[in-house]
């Protein structure tokens, strides 16, 4: 008789999840010499320990503490790029501008990017059928708590000028409920961070509006200013040209506004 299993609203754990995490860890530590000493089996043990045998709606940041510890990574604190609702362009940017880092360029972000996982209370099984959805089921699920925890630590580590890439095509360019708006903004350390510079990425080719005047950007400016951090904003009217100019800054067409 098959055992009764909780049916959640979200997709189940990504197939071959343990193998994927371990393989990603090995690949990352081979490519990044500063993390070469990290023992990927211990990293997997810590990852597994955060959610296996635990109720998938009752996960805490402390559950992930061992994993966070093993994944501790020093990135240049003045070279951090945050993003909200525009992951692909942010990643394309750091692939070209190799001295800047998104969360997914760190070991822990790389391990979990685009993956889903959850377990079941009191069993050592991974649930490949379904996992809790943030809205429909619960917010304290393994995936959401993981990203909240790593995002908090990533923001806490930032210094000097921090950049954030925002999607100008969305109705809320700055969304207080996004990970950036609810976690990262509030964990930038005013004693270390001087300025938050927003890059608002335009979607339409003919869109010449100044999206830095958008009410949600003004809201972001207000939140940041109240935290004694300066705020600046730039429109990126042509993201394709922007990337091209990052690749080839000497190009004559790169002196004009992008």
């Amino acid at each position: 008789v098959p055992r009764w299993r909780q049916q959640w609203s979200g997709p189940g754990t990504t197939k071959r999840f343990p193998e994927t995490v371990l393989a990603r860890c090995v690949k990352y530590t081979e490519i990044h010499p500063e993390m070469r000493h990290v023992d990927c089996q211990s990293v997997w043990d810590a990852f597994k320990g955060a959610f296996i045998s635990k109720h998938p709606c009752n996960i805490t940041e402390e559950d992930y503490q061992p994993l966070m510890k093993l994944g501790t990574q020093t990135v240049p604190c003045n070279k951090i790029l945050l993003w909200s609702r525009i992951k692909d362009l942010a990643h394309q940017f750091t692939q070209v501008q190799r001295d800047m880092f998104t969360l997914e360029d760190t070991l822990l972000g790389y391990l979990a990017d685009d993956l889903t996982w959850c377990g079941e209370f009191n069993t050592s099984k991974i649930n490949y059928q379904s996992c809790p959805d943030w809205r429909k089921d619960c917010s304290n699920n393994p995936v959401s708590v993981f990203w909240k925890t790593v995002s908090r630590r990533f923001a806490e580590a930032a210094c000097d000028v921090v950049h954030v890439m925002l999607n100008g095509s969305r109705s809320k360019i700055f969304d207080k409920n996004s990970t950036f708006g609810s976690v990262e903004v509030h964990n930038l350390q005013p004693e270390k961070v001087q300025t938050l510079e927003a890059w608002v990425i335009h979607g339409g080719r003919e869109d010449s509006r100044d999206l830095c005047q958008d009410p949600t950007i003004k809201e972001l400016e207000s939140i940041i200013s109240k935290r004694n951090i300066q705020f600046s904003c730039k429109n990126i009217y042509r993201p394709d040209k922007f990337l091209q100019c990052v690749k080839n800054p000497e190009d004559s067409s790169c002196t004009s506004e992008i």
Epitope: E34, M35, H37, V38, S42, D45, A46, K48, G49, S53, E61, E62, Q65, P66, M68, K69, L70, G71, T72, Q73, T74, P76, C77, T149, R153, E156, A157, C159, K192
Partner: antibody
Framework: SLEESGGDLVKPGASLTLTCTAS????????ICWIRQAPGKGLEWVAC????????KYYANWAKGRFTVSKTSSTTVTLQMTSLTGADTATYFC???????????????WGPGTLVTVSS | AQVLTQTPSSVSAAVGGTVTINCQCS????????LAWYQHKPGQPPKLLMY???NLASGVPSRFKGSGSGSQFTLTIGEVQSDDAATYYC??????????FGGGTEVVVR
Amino acid sequence: SLEESGGDLVKPGASLTLTCTASGFSFNNYWICWIRQAPGKGLEWVACIYSPSGDIKYYANWAKGRFTVSKTSSTTVTLQMTSLTGADTATYFCARELSGSSYEGYFESWGPGTLVTVSS
Amino acid sequence: AQVLTQTPSSVSAAVGGTVTINCQCSQSVYGHNWLAWYQHKPGQPPKLLMYRASNLASGVPSRFKGSGSGSQFTLTIGEVQSDDAATYYCQGYYNGGSYAFGGGTEVVVR
């Protein structure tokens, strides 16, 4: 508090197991690490373990392979050392890390240490 | 491997004076400020003084001050007392949760 035991005078090539015993708290939700200090030298980190359910452990590069950290009960952690050489002569401390993710990376509580001497 | 260089290796101070100990890290510590200071007296376990570069550990007098960020840190002991005679160590926190200690600074109080 923490207390180390098992330090001894041993010959090169020998093995030795040190024990760290807690009183007044259990190891279950703390990182416990081993740190050593050679005579007249500075402190050197060896290994750490965290054991809420399954053991999570990691080591300094130089300690991998020869040293093994284990939790043997909720109040005892051991450090097994093999193929000992004169360079391993040191006072070995166990230490408890500050709890909470904002405080990791520091040792709030140390044992008095146990002396290991490797000599023929 | 990370190297933490403490200077001076030994310092003598009069009671009521000030002592400054520097810790230079070969690589920036995690989070730019993940550095601790310990006081170690002979026959006793080391005692945590400061964490996150400038935060005083519980029960430590405010005469102890920590500063610095990245790879350069300083411990200052103001109004030195005879009880402050000890060896002081800095300790950084690094990639993969690894730790590295400085070589120590002996403080002699005269």
